[in-house]
Amino acid sequence: ATKLTEEKYELKEGQTLDVKCDYTLEKFASSQKAWQIIRDGEMPKTLACTERPSKNSHPVQVGRIILEDYHDHGLLRVRMVNLQVEDSGLYQCVIYQPPKEPHMLFDRIRLVVTKGFSGTPGSNENSTQNVYKIPPTTTKALCPLYTSPRTVTQAPPKSTADVSTPDSEINLTNVTDIIRVPVFN
């Protein structure tokens, strides 16, 4: 079995997480790809996904998450802008390949978002916080509702405008026009 590895990112509120997930070009270029959060004891939850089939270099924005699939480079770029403390958590990229299980891309991302000064060695304590604002999105994202054909206990969110639950670790504000459709039966 392949060892699950993760890379840790420590960022401050207002900053941007900007990461890449490499994939095999020939196999997965046009496959639909997704960005998921993994919470303890739960199945991974899809936060954003590319179109199906995935379009080359076409940004898909869901709230503060921007996905760009560079087919010619064999990488999915994920940006989470204007980070909030609640965004802290473990994330992963996956490739949907129904009816098979989603294919996970290495490595996982351990995101730690801190308020103000992090006090960690090597960080700059005097930096001004970036409060970059992004325009609201109009992108429609057709994400599979379930991350696994065996995951049938999760009910769809009541509102497409809020994909977070009251006790969730991530709060996706300004999420508009997300269409969630189950692709696994």
Epitope: E7, Q15, T16, D22, H73, V81, N124
Partner: antibody, heavy 121, light 105 residues
Amino acid sequence: QVQLVQSGAEVKKPGASVKVSCKASGYTFNGYYIHWVRQAPGQGLEWMGWLNPNSGGANYAQKFQGRVTMTRDTSISTAYMELSRLRSDDTAVYYCARDQRKTTVTPFEYWGQGTLVTVSS
Amino acid sequence: SYELTQPPSVSVSPGQTASITCSGDKLGERQVSWYQLKPGQSPVLVIYQDNKRPSGIPERFSGSKSGNTATLTISGTQAMDEADYYCQAWDRNVVFGGGTKLTVL
């Protein structure tokens, strides 16, 4: 510790090709992108492209498309940058550099010592 | 194509604070890195992820970002800080700013 060691200086004639090598050590070669950056005399840093050693895939800056080829030999943890149809304005110091992390494209934390390529008739 | 704009030169007296700016479209959505380049040497990463210092970089180097402008600040500038400084970001491709020559008077 991570090290990138480049091949020695080259003198080439216009129209010729040059192939610069970059031998990596101290880490898993396949895990991190290798970038090539050059600096011409009196000019700034110019990104030429990246190589994904795992897949062998490369991404080139538009300016160098069709003239540059980036390859690797994983058995000896070495990346190569070949620039063809050389012109006098290709005279520069060429650097290889490695990504800081597997999951990012920038920044470049580790750099080779540089290879001076002189194009002169 | 994506461009990052830096002032060509900045002058500062020893012990004073030097500030070098870098601006670009949607830079607020991108992480900025800064490199120091001295003649005859390889570039050195001095700031990454907008404001983090790699180990071994003196505390007088700091980075910040406001909107679409990133700033490299060198507090208590020393003669040894005289060099060219480049900002960098990743758009579709990797982009360097034009560079700023820092002169310590």
